[in-house]
Interface confidence: medium
């Protein structure tokens, strides 16, 4: 349906509060360096304009597209050239090229310092003084650090954030109330950001088909009672929603997401028995609840897959006359029967099935050729199962920090050209898979671990794409979305790597290390470990263990010393010399 004024349509659909929040997020994701006050002003102006268009749809400029209106507004920012350099050139282009240009300048690693919360009393004062501004600042700070954050979900988290402050600012011990709640929210927000970045990368690098396949598998696992037509309808709508958000069309995205939630709730009888309590909630909570809803029980009477996909005489006809739909049905049927498999594994199985049919349907006797296709899946299933088993055993033995260090060593040896901060960030996140997944029951471990690894490895791919330094990383990232994890797992030590020159500055530490929070202390030590490996890539695990043990003792000793700085400057060079000697 065409509207006279697109901006009025979205304003009316979303309501003023959500509209303003989404505009603020959109601008913050595009112009990540601009101060908060500038974005508040821009968002206010756009909201006022939308309100005027809602009152009078034929008003001046109300008929312009959202890209035109937003782009024109962005291009009024005076400091564009100074702050963003060649991004200012985008303003010389016409739509849709101008928007594409802005999207291309989104920075996944803007390098802002981590958000540090002020004292609880100051926070509560700011919250109570101007709640709207306080929550706007939250939206801004998250959005500029995460330019692909799923905007409607960010509105939901802002609402949660508001709830935390409303509760804790009344508490006797504000700090004790706020601390754990804010930390738990922070973890959720970071995971949400990484998951959406993965979805956007799937769409942008591998296209709609890859995203749809991923969604069919995931939703078929979650809603095994829904039939394929229902799953297909939801997947089509979900693809549109994420394409819009990944493309910066946040108003359309949020509006379409609300419509999808409405559809699912109106048709819950044919989707899942688990949607009931989600559907009684207001729109933001409803959509979030539906996205996180627990898996429905499997129907009891599912026939064998072989009947349709192996034994049926029409397999090749089905495949050749409608490949995508036939493979989609295969994926759907397989996924709903295997909630314990990771989505990545299910997609690999579908790919294997496709390859088998491609080969067999060209032979004289296709049924004989593909008769054993389902048995041939065994090695594909065994690989992630064994990987999860081995790594969870290692995690249980070493704990999170030790497991992260083992992964740091592993990944630095695979791709030593990658920057140290990236290796540390990615290995720390990979290490969290142990904490997140290894305590789960056997039936949930693989799905939890492999799908989480896919999200983390996507972060590596995104950062590496910005400054490519390793051909093998480029290869694993770009060849196949579903095989990224096996590709990285299969990388051996890079024998072509020329060790980095020793730089004493890299291994110089100061007393400020002692006052750092534990997580930041770990990052410092892990940074040293990576640099050590880049200098001595042939170091054995035993040697590294010794050196890291010595390093830990050195930090402990100096942090307990009377003259901390003196201890660091005196003992540091001795430690470095001993480490070099140990690693010969």
């Amino acid at each position: 349906e065409a509207y006279k004024s697109e901006i009025a349509h979205r304003y009316n659909d979303l309501g003023e509060e959500h509209f303003r929040g989404l505009v603020l997020v959109a601008f913050s994701q595009y112009l990540q360096q601009c101060p908060f006050e500038d974005h508040v002003k821009l968002a206010k102006e756009v909201t006022e304009f939308a309100k005027a268009c809602a009152a009078e749809e034929s008003g001046a400029n109300c008929d312009k597209s959202l890209h035109t209106l937003f782009g024109d507004k962005l291009c009024t920012v005076a400091s564009l050239r100074d702050k963003y350099g060649d991004m200012a050139d985008c303003c010389e282009k016409q739509e849709p090229d101008r928007n594409e240009c802005f999207l291309a300048h989104k920075d996944d690693n803007p390098g802002f310092p981590p958000l540090v919360a002020p004292e609880p009393d100051a926070l509560c004062a700011a919250f109570q003084d101007n709640e709207q501004l306080f929550l706007g600042k939250y939206l801004y700070e998250i959005a500029r650090r995460h330019p692909y954050f799923y905007a409607p979900e960010l509105l939901y988290y802002a609402q949660q954030y508001k709830g935390v402050f409303a509760e804790c600012c009344q508490a006797a011990d504000k700090a004790a109330c706020l601390g754990p709640k804010i930390e738990a929210l922070r973890e959720k927000v970071l995971l949400s950001s990484a998951k959406e970045r993965f979805k956007c990368a799937s769409l942008q690098k591998f296209g709609d088909r890859a995203f749809k396949a991923w969604s069919v598998a995931r939703l078929s696992q979650r809603f095994p009672k829904a039939d394929f037509a229902e799953i297909s309808k939801v997947v089509t709508d979900l693809t549109k929603v994420h394409k819009e958000c990944c493309h910066g069309d946040l108003l359309e995205c949020a509006d379409d997401r609300a419509d999808l939630a409405k559809y699912m709730c109106e048709n819950q009888d044919s989707i899942s028995t688990k949607l009931k309590e989600c559907c009684d909630k207001p729109v933001l909570e409803k959509s979030q609840c539906l996205a996180e809803v627990e898996r429905d029980e499997l129907p009891g009477d599912l026939p064998s897959l072989a009947a349709d996909f192996v034994e049926d005489k029409e397999v090749c006809k089905n495949y050749q006359e409608a490949k995508d739909v036939f493979l989609g049905t295969f994926l759907y049927e397989y996924a709903r029967r295997h909630p314990e498999y990771s989505v990545s594994l299910l997609l690999r199985l579908a790919k294997e099935y496709e390859a088998t049919l491609e080969k067999c349907c060209a032979t004289d006797d296709p049924p004989t050729c593909y008769a054993k296709v389902l048995d041939e899946f065994k090695p594909l299933v065994d690989e992630p199962q064994n990987l999860v088993k081995t790594n969870c055993e290692l995690f249980e033995k070493l704990g999170e920090y030790g497991f992260q260090n083992a992964l740091l060593v592993r990944y630095t040896k695979k791709a030593p050209q990658v920057s140290t901060p990236t290796l540390v960030e990615v290995s720390r996140k990979l290490g969290k898979v142990g904490t997140k997944c290894c305590k789960k029951p056997e039936s949930e471990r693989m799905s939890c671990a492999e799908d989480f690894l896919s999200v983390v490895l996507n972060r590596l791919c995104v950062l590496h794409e910005k400054t490519p330094v390793s051909e093998r990383v480029t290869k694993c990232c770009s060849e196949s979305l579903v095989n990224r994890r096996p590709c990285f797992s299969g990388l051996e030590v890079d024998e072509t790597y020329v060790p980095k020159e020793f730089n004493a500055e890299t291994f110089t530490f100061h007393a400020d290390l002692c006052t750092l929070p534990e997580a930041e202390k770990q990052v410092k030590k892990q940074t040293a470990l990576v640099e050590l490996l880049k200098h001595k890539p042939k170091a054995t695990d035993e040697q590294l263990k010794t050196v890291m043990g010595d390093f830990g003792a050195f930090v402990e000793k100096c942090c307990a010393a009377e003259n901390k700085e003196g201890c660091f400057s005196e003992e540091g060079p001795k430690l470095v010399a001993a480490a070099q000697a140990a690693l010969v």
């Epitope: 037509a229 297909s232 349709d308 089905n318 409608a322 049927e333």
Partner: nanobody, 126 residues
Framework: EVQLLESGGGLVQPGGSLRLSCAAS????????VAWFRQAPGKEREFVAG????????YYADSVKGRFTISRDNSKNTLYLQMNSLRPEDTAVYYC???????????????????WGQGTLVTVSS
């Protein structure tokens, strides 16, 4: 739930024609694999023709190929079976069956269809 209601059966002479209809409710007919089966007295139920869901791929038993045509009218939510050059051995109760779980896949195995009509009798006799 899918409800199916067949009509159009009757007595016809050999060489004659009949058009069976199957009206569906509770589900859009283009979203589900649908098929016609038949059962002659004292015999097993057998597949006659099918059409895939979402994609119009048609399937026929060898015994009816070239004589019978399966089609659907999405606007009327109805499935049809046009039967020409009828033979005495075509005499049977004809059933319409639907399989919404997997559109596209029209199986020839009756057990894989959860929804059935009550059947309409076709008698071919002089």
């Amino acid at each position: 739930e899918v409800q199916l209601l067949e009509s159009g059966g009757g007595l016809v002479q050999p060489g004659g024609s009949l058009r069976l209809s199957c009206a569906a409710s509770g589900r859009y007919i283009d979203e589900t694999a649908v098929a016609w089966f038949r059962q002659a007295p004292g015999k097993e139920r057998e597949f006659v023709a099918g059409i895939g869901g979402g994609v119009d791929i048609t399937y026929y038993a060898d015994s009816v190929k070239g004589r019978f045509t399966i089609s659907r009218d999405n606007s009327k939510n109805t499935l049809y079976l046009q039967m020409n050059s009828l033979r005495p051995e075509d005499t049977a109760v004809y059933y319409c069956a639907a399989r919404p779980g997997s559109p596209l896949i029209t199986s020839k195995v009756a057990d894989l269809y959860p929804y059935w009509g009550q059947g309409t009798l076709v008698t071919v006799s002089s």
